[in-house]
Interface confidence: medium
Amino acid sequence: AVNGTSQFTCFYNSRANISCVWSQDGALQDTSCQVHAWPDRRRWNQTCELLPVSQASWACNLILGAPDSQKLTTVDIVTLRVLCREGVRWRVMAIQDFKPFENLRLMAPISLQVVHVETHRCNISWEISQASHYFERHLEFEARTLSPGHTWEEAPLLTLKQKQEWICLETLTPDTQYEFQVRVKPLQGEFTTWSPWSQPLAFRTKPAALGKDT
């Protein structure tokens, strides 16, 4: 039996994946639980098995098709249920009518690369992954640079308020190792949130030219 409060949160990656986390305060025995997706206007439905990520939370990914296939639209509503097995029966533990394009979280940007690096600046580009064509250019980015002796949390956020898949970092220190990350968010969706941060890209600025003796 399950007691306590339950939280069920899901995000759509805009293409073919709904990721869900279910948290349950009360004690849950070693029970098999599933997320079941039932679209209102599609002929498919889908389940995924919730696997523990901590003592009181479970997660799974509803894989709706090939990674770049557009499986849902702005008009879809998907009924999402958490069902847990109790003997031979399944008990509904949580339910929500999920509007995918109101609950977006894109995949982290990929293919980060240094386009050009100098002593004091560095030009970096990246690509977005599995993002719907529906967004056109309606995306924004946040970026951060890790300087020596600092943590990611201390790094100031740079905001790009348009779909710009490059950045020129300036006022860098010569001959210094940095790391760079970027994340993306669609402008659409009441509950939309930032993607995970990209994998960090390490780069080093060029050394300053040696001064000539006078």
Partner: nanobody, 123 residues
Framework: QVQLVESGGGLVQAGGSLRLSCVVS????????MAWFRQAPGKEREFVAA????????EYVDSVKGRFTVSRDNAKNTVYLQMNNLKPEDTAVYYC????????????????WGQGTQVTVSS
């Protein structure tokens, strides 16, 4: 459209073992709960075993519990049925089935099917 191809069937003496394999192609394998069914001559096709998308949860018909083990290798797009201590009553054509909905996998109606592999257990 997903395609399923079974292999590993054959003739075996009672008490022996066989391992059936089913390779899945044409779609993203981890979308699917996988199952094995069997059909003996003159009988309905019956559910034998199923394994969820992650491979963590399995279920079996009572008559094979403790003798059969279903498993999957998501890297190889393959589901297996290890059959030990086989009995003459296990003789049947064994079918691999796939369904994106775990809750319908026991139903014969909405699954994708392989062509089947014959298992014959002699006494």
């Amino acid at each position: 459209q997903v395609q399923l191809v079974e292999s590993g069937g054959g003739l075996v003496q009672a008490g022996g073992s066989l391992r059936l394999s089913c390779v899945v192609s044409g779609d993203v394998f981890v979308r699917y709960t996988m199952a094995w069914f069997r059909q003996a001559p003159g009988k309905e096709r019956e559910f034998v075993a199923a394994v969820t998308d992650s491979g963590r949860t399995t279920e079996y018909v009572d008559s094979v519990k403790g003798r059969f083990t279903v498993s999957r290798d998501n890297a190889k797009n393959t589901v297996y049925l290890q059959m030990n201590n086989l009995k003459p009553e296990d003789t049947a054509v064994y079918y691999c089935a796939a369904n994106t909905d775990y809750f319908q996998i026991r139903s014969v109606d909405n699954n994708a099917w392989g062509q089947g592999t014959q298992v014959t257990v002699s006494s």
